[in-house]
């Protein structure tokens, strides 16, 4: 007997071929011995089973010798062993319909869960293996579940459902609902202006919601809310911003925050989240804003930063066109009687410049 | 047991539409066909159609552009409408469950029927 | 369609008489055909289904036979209780189709 594997709503072609290759009297019946269709003279007939409706056959292909059935929207209750009859032989074809399905949602929240069901007849054993796009490897049976969804679990997955050697594949889109980016850093120089992105890692029709940036900074003993905003198809409105420091926010997206000047006492780090509509659960991005500040008292020239820096990072005070330079992996360093010239206060990882900062030292006589 | 009971007007007037419902109890209306069949005094049965939960009803090609069919899950029910009825309407009425299974297809389950009189 | 001819329409039989029914389909049914009793304000019930396979239930005296077009009712012992209009039901093709009915009357 011959097995045919169907996915739920697809169609599906059941070949039945006479040795003649021309038109003769066939029926297709099901397990019930009913008839589903068949041919009456050079008509096509159909009979009282469920399947009726949603079967058919390719009449070009009669004179050849072909008298497959068509099964369009399958339904897991399909699942049976169909009978086609022609030349006094018959040909059994066991036909599997499964269903692969996502429990809630494809829409997820990042850190959710996923669970794929699938559905498949009475007294099929099947496997399924599926595959994320970031190539994550996942096996189950009835149900298969992924605990924490991460960003880069986002798009399209692709299951094979195995049953008596033969496979059915299902293709099934999760988006992740998250930022593009866990965390930020922005570092900026004193009284610079300062501009927050935070871009989404999805795109969706209508994009309703609410949401808050809260913020720590390094020399408060508290957070606080810096700014309350609504967002509704994809417009967003202020309902409420601190005095200081006054943030204005781009009414489109993605969202976009500005600080107008960079201020020490900001320095710190924020989060900012997002409650969607008819979701349960809020899309978080940290964002960290680093303050650079060079000054030149009396004798002294000093270099700091404020908010959340790295051990590993260095802050150096050098002159420019000469080698002199002071270097620490701290957030202060200082010159006492600095040579005139051009300083430069350099905030760098490894290497790499993170933040710059001139200041010119003049001659004292 | 599964019971059918019919109900609906009695008497239409000519041209206008006949109205059926066929009320399910003891069982459920999602896993079967259901039908509608006549009868008209000194003729025999005529099916009329069927109409299953999920797929699009069957009519008898002799009355299909005058009769729809259809089922809410949610009363366990399903009807009839036969518009611009005439005299020839006039029959009993009855909703039967169709059943099929190994060999069989057919009515097992029958309402009692309803009296349909089409006069002005 | 698939028309059903049934005859006769109309007979009359004694108690404990053989009864013969006959029903033509205008085309090949198959044994796509079963035969139902009706009576007096009743539904019909379901009496032989696949031409010859008897339903649960119902009396041994009743029995069916033929393909393709030509199919034959019979009752081999009438009892009083089996005065009714009986009738064949092709189930072959949609539309479901029935014959005219025989009336079994007591003579």
């Known amino acids: 007997k011959k097995v045919v594997l169907g996915k739920k709503g697809d169609t599906v072609e059941l070949t039945c071929n006479a040795s003649q290759k021309k038109n003769t009297q066939f029926h297709w019946k099901n397990s019930n011995q009913i008839k589903i269709l068949g041919i009456q003279g050079l008509f096509l007939t159909k009979g009282p089973s469920k399947l009726s409706d949603r079967a058919d056959s390719r009449k070009s292909l009669w004179d050849q010798g072909c008298f497959s059935m068509i099964i369009k929207n399958l339904k897991i209750e399909d699942s049976d062993t169909y009978i086609c009859e022609v030349e006094n032989k018959k040909e059994e074809v066991e036909l599997l319909v499964f269903g692969l399905t996502a429990n809630s949602d494809t829409h997820l929240l990042e850190g959710q869960s996923l669970t794929l069901t699938l559905e498949s007849p009475p007294g099929s054993s099947p496997s399924v293996k599926c595959r994320s796009p970031g190539g994550k490897n996942i096996q189950g049976g009835r149900t298969i579940s992924v605990p924490q969804l991460e960003r880069q679990d986002s798009g399209t997955w692709t299951c094979t459902v195995s049953q008596d050697q033969k496979t059915v594949e299902f293709k099934i889109d999760i988006v992740v609902l998250a930022f593009q980016k866990a965390s930020s850093t922005v570092y900026k120089k004193e009284g610079e202006q300062v501009e927050f992105s935070f871009p989404l890692a999805f795109t969706l029709e209508k994009l309703t919601g609410s949401g808050e940036l809260w913020w720590q900074a390094e020399r408060a003993s508290s957070s606080k809310s810096w700014i309350t905003f609504d967002l509704k198809n994809k417009e967003v409105s202020v309902k409420r911003v601190t005095q200081d420091p006054k943030l204005q926010m781009g009414k489109k997206l993605p969202l976009h925050l500005t600080l107008p000047q960079a201020l020490p006492q900001y320095a710190g780090s924020g989060n900012l989240t997002l409650a969607l509509e008819a979701k349960t659960g809020k899309l978080h991005q940290e964002v960290n804003l680093v303050v650079m500040r060079a000054t030149q008292f009396q004798e002294n020239l000093t270099c700091e930063v404020w908010g959340p820096t790295s051990p590993k990072l260095t802050l150096s005070l050098k002159l420019e066109n000469k080698g002199a330079t002071v270097s620490k992996q701290a957030k202060a360093v200082w010159v006492l009687n600095p040579e005139a010239g051009m300083w430069q206060c350099l905030l760098s990882d490894s290497g790499q410049v993170l933040l710059e900062s001139n200041i010119k030292v003049v001659p004292t006589w | 047991q599964v019971q059918l009971q019919e109900s609906g007007p009695g008497l239409v007037k000519p041209s206008e539409t006949l109205s059926l419902t066929c009320t399910v109890s003891g069982g459920s209306i999602s896993t079967y066909y259901w039908s509608w069949i006549r009868q008209s005094a000194g003729k025999g049965l005529e099916w009329i159609g069927r109409?299953?939960?999920?797929?699009?009803?069957n009519y008898n090609p002799s009355l299909k552009s005058r009769v729809t069919m259809s089922v809410d899950t949610s009363k366990n029910q399903f009807s009839l409408k036969l518009n611009s009825v005439s005299a020839a309407d006039t029959a009993v009425y009855y909703c039967?469950?169709?059943?099929?299974?190994?060999?069989?297809?057919?009515?097992?389950?029958w309402g009692q029927g309803t009296t349909v009189t089409v006069s002005s | 369609d698939v028309q059903m001819t049934q005859s006769p329409s109309s007979l009359s039989a004694s108690v404990g008489g053989r009864v013969t029914i006959t029903c033509q389909a205008s085309?090949?049914?198959?044994?796509?055909l079963n035969w139902y009793q009706q009576k007096p304000g009743k539904a019909p019930k379901l009496l032989i289904y696949?031409?010859?396979n008897l339903e649960t239930g119902v009396p041994s005296r009743f029995s069916g036979s033929g393909s393709g077009t030509d199919f034959t009712f019979t009752i081999s012992s009438l009892q009083p209780e089996d005065f009714a209009t009986y009738y064949c039901q092709q189930y072959d093709n949609l539309p479901l189709t029935f014959g005219g009915g025989t009336k079994v009357e007591i003579k």
């Open positions: 085309q090949d049914i198959s044994n796509y």
């Open positions: 696949y031409a010859s």
């Open positions: 039967a469950r169709e059943l099929e299974r190994p060999y069989y297809y057919g009515m097992d389950v």
């Open positions: 109409i299953y939960t999920s797929e699009r009803p």
